[in-house]
Interface confidence: medium
């Protein structure tokens, strides 16, 4: 997420070929430009080795955590719920993104030495990770809404439908990340190390803005509204019916959603502000431009950190995950079977109770 860089970017190079009179970055200001403030592009100054260490830590945590999550879900074939399938895909998305982090880390030190193909692939995986994440969480919210508010098990009973939804999510995520695949490339220059960034050439401003607004709308705002609607009604139903057990069972899902929003909402709000400024809804000033650039740097790290946080949530809040993990360790003789909790069940995220399936 280009510019996301969405960052992204998340869509980074939106100024090429546009009238730059409103944002004149001036190294030294001649007398006739005294009315225009001197302005150079700025971003946070962070030591590149610190960035590499962060990447390495997130990579190791994400690789270990998400591999374990996938292992536990795949082991518990018997009581696997719909939510489990979504969480399995969520872990897969995080794992795929984590695998790109060593490449980003290496590029921080040596520049982008991996060529355009890898530039496109690793950038795509970052975007797909974000979009699939929010779309899967939206699907979980719909599933919980149907199960708790409408007491229906339609989705739960039709496993093929869940698989189709997951495949559709991956397909839609790829579609939303397509601008990155199209425009990201390795740019070679005599003055700087090779760089992997969004080079949109001389496309018209409208076309470029459309490619930024569409993914932001359909990939972030729409799923966010779905989640707010579904969880709003789900919470209302739980509180009205005093469903203590089910409320506890929803803790992990709420934690997952909350962490996702805390990690990705700031970055996407900054990206939205950036888009509004580029479309001149908000007036562009040098100060605002640089504030946004610094804010993109400050908030993007939260999105990167997110890929290793879900397993920690399951480990600390999800009782069933802990039990499932201990069960696998016991099966392989890594721990004594006596140390297994008495209520340890084969399901990763829960047992069916009435018309709902409790989670984690």
């Amino acid at each position: 997420m280009e510019d996301f860089n969405m960052e992204s970017d998340s869509f980074e190079d939106f100024w090429k070929g546009e009238d730059l009179s409103n944002y004149s970055y001036s190294s030294t200001l001649p007398p006739f430009l005294l009315d225009a403030a001197p302005c150079e592009p700025e971003s946070l100054e962070i030591n590149k080795y610190f960035v590499v260490i962060i990447y390495a830590l997130v990579f190791l945590l994400s690789l270990l955590g998400n591999s374990l999550v996938m292992l536990v879900i795949l082991y518990s074939r018997v009581g696997r719920s719909v939510t489990d399938v979504y969480l399995l895909n969520l872990a897969l998305a995080d794992l795929l993104f984590a695998l790109t982090l060593p490449i980003w880390a290496a590029s921080k030190v040596n520049g982008w030495i991996f060529g355009t193909f890898l530039c496109k692939v690793v950038s795509l995986l970052k975007e797909v990770n974000f979009y699939s994440g929010i779309l899967l969480l939206a699907c979980i919210s719909v599933d919980r809404y149907l199960a708790i508010v409408h007491a229906t098990r339609t989705l739960t009973q039709k496993r093929y439908l869940v698989k189709f939804i997951c495949l559709s999510i991956w397909g839609l995520s790829l579609l939303l990340a397509l601008p990155v695949l199209l425009f990201r490339r390795t740019v070679y220059s005599s003055n700087v190390s090779p760089a992997c960034y969004e080079d949109m050439g001389n496309n018209t401003a409208n076309w470029r803005m459309l490619l930024r607004i569409l993914p932001q709308s359909f990939g972030f705002i729409v799923p966010l509204l779905i989640m707010l609607f579904c969880y709003g009604f789900t919470l209302r139903t739980l509180f009205k019916a005093h469903m203590g057990q089910k409320h506890r069972a929803m803790r992990v899902i709420f934690a997952v959603v909350l962490i996702f929003l805390l990690c990705w909402l700031p970055y996407n709000l900054v990206l939205l502000a950036d888009t509004l400024m580029r479309t001149q809804v908000i007036q562009e000033t040098c100060e605002r431009r640089n504030h946004i650039d610094r804010a993109l740097d400050a908030t993007e790290i939260l999105g990167i950190l997110h890929s290793c946080l879900n397993p920690l949530i399951y480990a600390f809040i999800g009782q069933k995950f802990r039990h499932g993990l201990l069960k696998i360790l016991a099966i392989h003789g890594l721990i004594s079977k006596d140390s297994l909790p008495k209520d340890s069940r084969p399901s990763f995220v829960g047992s069916s109770s009435g018309h709902t399936s409790t989670t984690l």
């Epitope: 980074e12 100024w15 001036s26 592009p41 700087v192 993007e300």
Partner: nanobody, 126 residues
Framework: EVQLLESGGGLVQPGGSLRLSCAAS????????MGWYRQAPGKQRELVAD???????NYADSVKGRFTISRDNSKNTVYLQMNSLRPEDTAVYYC????????????????????WGQGTLVTVSS
């Protein structure tokens, strides 16, 4: 940090010639347009000539046929060859460049900036 360094200005007699050069340095990804502007005392700034990365050239009517702009993309340098100089060409000549630079800690983002040099004085007088 990007810097534009001009050179070649000075005192010249009417009908004489001068060659201005402007070199861009720093973390530059690409330079889109490079050009020369001038400002005579008490007058507004005006475009003298500019040249795109593709080689498209634009001249002010007052200098057509006398001035020639050229650039060396490999050296990030723009030149202005000034022939048949007139007293009315006396001004401070500023180098201007539309430069793409990279910003960003985690993911690199391209930003295009309009950079200016400090100026070089050209005096045409007998």
């Amino acid at each position: 940090e990007v810097q534009l360094l001009e050179s070649g200005g000075g005192l010249v007699q009417p009908g004489g010639s001068l060659r201005l050069s402007c070199a861009a340095s720093g973390s530059i990804v690409r330079i889109n347009t490079m050009g020369w502007y001038r400002q005579a005392p008490g007058k507004q700034r005006e475009l003298v000539a500019d040249i795109t990365s593709g080689g498209n050239i634009n001249y002010a009517d007052s200098v057509k046929g006398r001035f020639t702009i050229s650039r060396d993309n490999s050296k990030n340098t723009v030149y202005l060859q000034m022939n048949s100089l007139r007293p009315e060409d006396t001004a401070v000549y500023y180098c201007n460049a539309e430069i793409v630079v990279l910003v960003g800690v985690w993911t690199q983002r391209a930003r295009t900036g309009n950079y200016w040099g400090q100026g070089t004085l050209v005096t045409v007088s007998s």
